[in-house]
């Protein structure tokens, strides 16, 4: 690694993340018709335009906003599952479920899935050894800008009813600093959206308790409510009929359709 | 289209046993949660008992518990209970339902239920 | 466990709209089951996830929950309509609860 190269304190770039960014928007536009005009090339274009040569500091929702545009796509408004620190779970639940979406059932959010990048202030480098941690270095990263910007925006094209699925194992089920608590929660428009709907999972098999009364869900119930949408809180104790769709996603226990 | 037949039931006297079995036909029976339910004459519907697909999670009402136990086998794809030590006020029709998918934890299908009658 | 409360009775005349109440502690924070029982014959799902209609189901029968109560309304109630009806919800691991079960009488 050259000297002068900034050390950042996480991971760096993924490897082949370039063809792999390539190769997934592929595959996503093959699959979902409505994408097929989409110029990948083009996607990925825009993709690199937003951070390459950038000091990965100094990123902007601005610097993606070519991507954005390359990447607008209509999903079904009142169809929405949001989520906080259940990401598996609330995959294989649109897995099966496929008449609801998540972000990363959505292009843009598809292509950038468990990946990470940063490029380099005034090269067209792509920086594989290190990038920014969001805590220890700084949020304007490349990866954090561009998780922020389409939370907001699909937290924006939401109505009716929205769903978020929750970790009930977790010490803070509602977690204001998570994107869920700090993004998506504050752009959901109150003149779409008439209600949330949590879905808070359970993960012990003896476990009987009522999450829904937990202080954080509380403080979700509150900060709802005071932009005017209604606030709707399920406990859902068996998340083991998520997994077995898996195994079987075409078997007819993987629809909520009676 | 989904069935549940359920057999088994008949006159015991108390502190006795009998087994149910369920036959289930027209979906995959590896797939659902199953349980029975029971409604002794005249009176309302009691959830007797729970099994999950893989048979790792069992779950059992405070009244039967320890004299009953829920099996199943995916093979044949049949649903048990097995009955013991039981009592004059276990009588009732036993049904045998299927859970529905998903995020919801209810009774989409059921078996025309089996008469189980406690009595000497 | 929760414990679920039903009207042992409830009596409409034909055409008119009948409301069954289900009432429990924070029964909104759980999604609540309707079924309709004939004498003689099997339970039948007419609600699930306290506002869903199975397919088959017709649409004069909805469901609503919030705060502690659940309501199953039936509109334009029919005489085929009179039957027993049973609440339920599942409150984690052996919590599976039936409310009393409610008689409509269509007059």
């Known amino acids: 690694v050259p000297r002068w190269r900034q050390q950042w304190s996480g991971p760096g770039t993924t490897k082949r993340f370039p063809e792999t960014v390539l190769a997934r928007c592929v595959k996503y536009t093959e699959i979902h018709p409505e994408m097929r005009h989409v110029d990948c090339q083009s996607v990925w274009d825009a993709f690199k335009g937003a951070f390459i040569s950038k000091h990965p500091c100094n990123i902007t929702e601005e610097d993606y906003q070519p991507l954005m545009k390359l990447g607008t796509q209509t999903v079904p408004c009142n169809k929405i599952l949001l989520w906080s620190r259940i990401k598996d779970l609330a995959h294989q639940f649109t897995q099966v479920q496929r008449d609801m979406f998540t972000l990363e059932d959505t292009l843009l959010g598809y292509l950038a899935d468990d990946l990470t990048w940063c490029g380099e202030f005034n090269t067209s480098k792509i920086n594989y050894q290190s990038c920014p941690d969001w805590r220890k270095d700084c949020s304007n990263n490349p990866v954090s800008v561009f998780w922020k910007t389409v939370s907001r925006r699909f937290a924006e094209a939401a109505c009716d009813v929205v769903h978020v699925m929750l970790n009930g194992s977790r010490s803070k089920i509602f977690d204001k600093n998570s994107t869920f608590g700090s993004v998506e929660v504050h752009n959901l428009q109150p003149e779409k959206v008439q209600t949330l709907e949590a879905w808070v999972i359970h993960g012990g098999r003896e476990d009987s308790r009522d999450l829904c009364q937990d202080p954080t869900i509380k403080e979700l119930e509150s900060i709802i409510s005071k932009r005017n949408i209604q606030f709707s809180c399920k406990n859902i104790y068996r998340p083991d009929k998520f997994l077995q769709c898996v195994k079987n996603p075409e078997d007819s226990s993987c629809t909520s359709e009676i | 289209q989904v069935q549940l037949v359920e057999s088994g039931g008949g006159l015991v006297q108390p502190g006795g046993s009998l087994r149910l079995s369920c036959a289930a036909s027209?979906?995959?029976?590896?797939?659902?949660?199953m349980n029975w339910v029971r409604q002794a004459p005249g009176k309302g519907l009691e959830w007797v008992s729970g099994?999950?697909?893989?048979?790792?999670?069992?779950y059992y009402a405070d009244s039967v518990k320890g004299r009953f136990t829920i099996s199943r086998d995916n093979s044949k794809n049949t649903l048990y209970l097995q009955m013991n030590s039981l009592r004059a006020e276990d009588t009732a029709v036993y049904y045998c339902?299927?859970?529905?998918?998903?995020?919801?934890?209810?009774?989409?299908?059921w078996g025309q239920g089996t008469l189980v009658t406690v009595s000497s | 466990d929760i414990e679920l409360t039903q009207p042992p009775s409830v009596s409409v005349a034909p055409g008119q709209t009948a409301r069954i109440s289900c009432s429990g502690d924070?029964?909104?924070?759980?999604?609540v089951y309707w079924y309709q029982q004939k004498p003689g014959q099997a339970p039948v799902l007419v609600i699930y996830?306290?506002?869903k209609r199975p397919s088959g189901i017709p649409e004069r029968f909805s469901g609503s929950n919030s705060g502690n109560t659940a309501t199953l309304t039936i509109s334009g109630t029919q005489a085929e309509d009179e039957a027993d009806y049973y609440c339920?919800?599942?409150?984690?691991?052996?919590?599976?609860?039936f409310g009393g079960g409610t008689k409509l009488t269509v007059l």
């Open positions: 339902a299927r859970d529905l998918p998903l995020v919801y934890t209810g009774f989409a299908y």
């Open positions: 027209g979906f995959t029976f590896s797939s659902y949660y």
């Open positions: 099994i999950n697909m893989e048979s790792t999670r069992i």
């Open positions: 924070n029964l909104r924070h759980y999604y």
């Open positions: 996830g306290d506002s």
């Open positions: 339920q919800t599942y409150t984690g691991g052996a919590s599976l609860v």
